[in-house]
């Protein structure tokens, strides 16, 4: 067979949540190979992912270190086998990323409830504080130690009997909401961050309702 | 001009440490992974693992992970390589090598290590 | 970790005659690399990407192969090749060598 060219990667794509962080590309490698570099825009190029026949790069380890700073990522293509490389005077061809602020743009993942707990007509909901990758003194940190204030809950709640549904928020991890006495609620969660302008909101948890295993029930 | 330049010959006793140094000048030092291949005598040449200077982060041959260290001082633009409980077997030269792609390369002279009682 | 099996690990061969060397991988590999070394001194790199060589390497040197057998050919061998030859994965971590085949003259 004869020589084919090198090809540049292109669609590059950031695909993050809860900062679980990778960065996608195309085309499958044909006589190929891909090694990824990823910078802070004042820092050096780190290769990862060296002289991978993959179309994915997990970038999570670089991203945690700073979740606020702004990311680039170049994909390089190297020629591997009967190939000739496109690049100038040897270099090879290469592709930028989109820029990746972690912080304003990593999506929320689909939060949990973690338990609920009636108390007469109160009824406290809880939702898991999800860990992140993200560490600090060696400790991985929560969503919550992560986004603090800056991440509510909507709770949205309704009797098991109808389909009116009710919402509140919190910008803790738990709720405490009336209920009617000897009526059994069904419950839902989501996160959000209302400052944000993309990737504001999660998907909805599961529906939780009471009169199952997570709930607790005190007169 | 990029240059590796590595610390002089090493005579240790079975059991011993050995830390060899590589100074790198001629590029920017914090950029680059680093490389640590070695040599038996008459022999092939082995993968020892690699440190990025930026951040310290390693990726050592899981042979040598509980003998080798790989660290680096920034300030002065030098790689180190650390074995301990050394060995006869361990008797070999030593190269640091600045990973790059393609035509580029860049290796330091070598360090000769000898385990010997 | 892929282990890179070269053969012959000795050759003596008469100027302008071809040679071949062979390196197997346990598994398969996509990138190989192939380095020249002579006595005394550090190993260069001589073949990067498979086929691809290094810049002032001599175009009677070639590489090729794919999968799990690779090949290193000098197809009229001059007194300056004398020398060993070490293929090498960057597939997968750790990076592997080959055990090194010496090509002398005769």
């Known amino acids: 067979s004869g020589t084919t060219n090198t090809v540049a990667a292109y669609n590059l794509t950031w695909k993050s949540t809860n900062f679980k962080t990778i960065l996608e590309w195309e085309p499958k490698p044909v006589n190929q190979v891909y090694t990824v570099q990823i910078s802070t825009k004042s820092g050096d190029w780190k290769s990862k992912c060296f002289y991978t026949t993959d179309t994915e790069c997990d970038l999570t380890d670089e991203i945690v270190k700073d979740v606020k700073q702004t990311y680039l990522a170049r994909v390089f293509s190297y020629p591997a086998g009967n190939v000739e490389s496109t690049g100038s005077a040897g270099e090879p061809l290469y592709e930028n990323s989109p820029e990746f602020t972690p912080y304003l743009e990593t999506n929320l993942g689909q939060p949990t409830i973690q338990s609920f707990e009636q108390v007469g007509t109160k009824v406290n909901v809880t939702v898991e504080d999800e860990r992140t990758l993200v560490r600090r003194n060696n400790t991985f940190l929560s969503l919550r130690d992560v986004f603090g204030k800056d991440l509510i809950y909507t709770l949205y709640y309704w009797k098991s009997s109808s389909s009116g549904k009710k919402t509140a928020k919190t910008n803790t991890n738990e709720f405490l909401i009336d209920v009617d006495k000897g009526e059994n609620y069904c419950f839902s969660v989501q996160a959000v961050i209302p400052s944000r302008t993309v990737n504001r909101k999660s998907t909805d948890s599961p529906v939780e309702c009471m009169g199952q295993e997570k709930g607790e029930f005190r007169e | 001009q990029v240059q590796l330049v590595q610390s002089g010959s090493e005579l240790k006793k079975p059991g011993a440490s050995v830390k060899v140094s590589c100074k790198a000048s001629g590029y920017s030092f914090i950029s680059y992974w680093m490389n640590w291949v070695r040599q038996a005598p008459g022999q092939g040449l082995e993968w020892i693992g690699m440190i990025y200077p930026a951040d310290s982060e390693t990726r050592l041959n899981q042979k040598f992970k509980d003998r080798a260290v790989l660290s680096v001082d920034k300030s002065v633009s030098t790689a180190y390589l650390q074995i301990c409980s050394l060995k006869a077997e361990d008797t070999a030269v030593y190269y640091c090598a600045r990973e790059d792609y393609g035509s580029s390369d860049y290796w330091g002279q070598g360090t000769t290590v000898t385990v010997s009682s | 970790e892929i282990v890179l099996t070269q053969s012959p690990d000795f050759q003596s061969v008469t100027p302008k005659e071809k040679v071949t060397i062979t390196c197997s991988a346990s598994?398969?590999?996509?990138?190989m690399n192939w380095y020249q070394q002579k006595p005394d001194q550090s190993p260069k790199i001589w073949i990067y990407g498979i086929s691809n060589l290094a810049s002032g390497v001599p175009s009677r040197f070639s590489g090729s192969g794919s999968g799990t057998d690779f090949t290193l050919t000098i197809n009229s061998l001059e007194a300056e090749d004398a020398a060993t030859y070490y293929c090498?994965?960057?597939?997968?971590?750790?990076?592997?060598f080959g055990g090194g085949t010496k090509v002398e003259i005769k």
């Open positions: 598994s398969s590999v996509s990138y």
């Open positions: 090498q994965q960057k597939s997968s971590f750790p990076w592997t």
